[in-house]
């Protein structure tokens, strides 16, 4: 396997694009187990109707690659666990990608992204100690291809659940 | 050990407001979002209001446009000022953190009641 991009390994912030620049997606700093920061994307809009932001990666170089996947480790509330909010409240987030020679794209249209598919929280998870809290991580991957662009970028829309991406790892197989 | 306090509830008229304040101790406030609930006699609770670390708000529908959640984290206090006050508000209030990362509730403070009269 060949890595493209780990959001584990980025120093610093990721500083990805989030739309509506306020309100939607929040970059985050945890401390894992060996007090190693974390930087996830939070959201948790569940009081309010119809949400809908976005977070799109940095360009990815494909790097000649056909078919690229992508492993997302995630948590996500059961609406159950949050009360009073079952009218609003979303246990499902959206992927999408966008293929692009360009890598500095200021501004891609929402219906210019592919969607990759509806991801929802997995019956099993992995329980990973976070200080005093046990933190229950969803691991999904999904592939996409054939590519023909030099590179591409990805997209998380999020439309109304409390999600937080933990890591995002993309990568291809090689041959 | 965690402690959650409320503070701030009464009895006030309809049309009235009230500042209700929370002080947390025994945690930091590293969660992604602190909130209130209410929990008005025999319904369930409900999030009415969350602030994140960032400053950004969220409210019910039956609250939007009345109240204002804030918060302090120098101080680890969050506070949720109501104007416009009705009936239907009269509930216990409680302060907790909600984070997408796992279940903040293992902990709930006491709770500050408010009556709306009409």
């Known amino acids: 396997e060949v890595t493209l991009l780990d959001s584990r390994s980025v120093q610093g912030e990721l500083g990805w694009i989030a739309s509506p620049l306020e309100g939607g997606w929040e970059e985050v700093s945890i401390m894992d187990e060996k007090n190693t920061p974390i930087r996830t994307y939070q959201v948790c809009n569940v009081m309010e109707p119809s949400q809908n932001n976005w977070l799109r990666t940095d360009w990815i170089t494909r790097e000649g690659a056909q078919r690229v996947y992508i492993e997302i480790k995630f948590t996500l509330r059961d609406c159950n666990s949050l009360p009073g909010v079952m009218g609003t409240c979303k246990e499902t987030f959206n992927l999408y990608y966008y293929e692009s020679d360009n890598d500095k794209e200021r501004f891609i249209r929402e219906n210019q992204f592919v969607k990759i598919d509806t991801i929802a929280a997995d019956e099993s998870f992995t329980q990973v100690d976070i200080g005093d809290r046990i933190m229950k991580l969803n691991t999904e991957i999904r592939d996409v291809g054939p590519l023909s662009k030099k590179g591409f970028y990805l997209a998380f829309q999020d439309v109304g659940a409390c999600i937080a991406l933990v890591s995002v790892r993309v990568f291809y197989k090689k041959a | 050990q965690v402690q959650l306090q409320e503070s701030g509830g009464g009895l006030v008229q309809a049309g009235g407001s009230l500042r209700l304040s929370c002080a947390a101790s025994g945690r930091t406030f590293n969660s992604y979002a602190e909130a209130w609930f209410r929990q008005a006699p025999g319904k369930e609770r409900e999030m009415i209001a969350a602030?994140?670390?960032?400053?950004?708000?969220n409210y019910a529908n039956p609250v939007k446009g009345r109240f204002t959640i804030s918060r302090d984290d120098a101080k680890n206090m969050v506070y949720l000022q109501m104007n416009n006050l009705k009936p239907e508000d009269s509930a216990v209030y409680y302060c907790n953190a909600i984070s997408p990362l796992w279940d903040e509730y293992d902990f709930w403070g006491p709770g500050t009641q408010v009556t709306v009269s009409s």
């Open positions: 602030v994140t670390k960032a400053g950004t708000t």
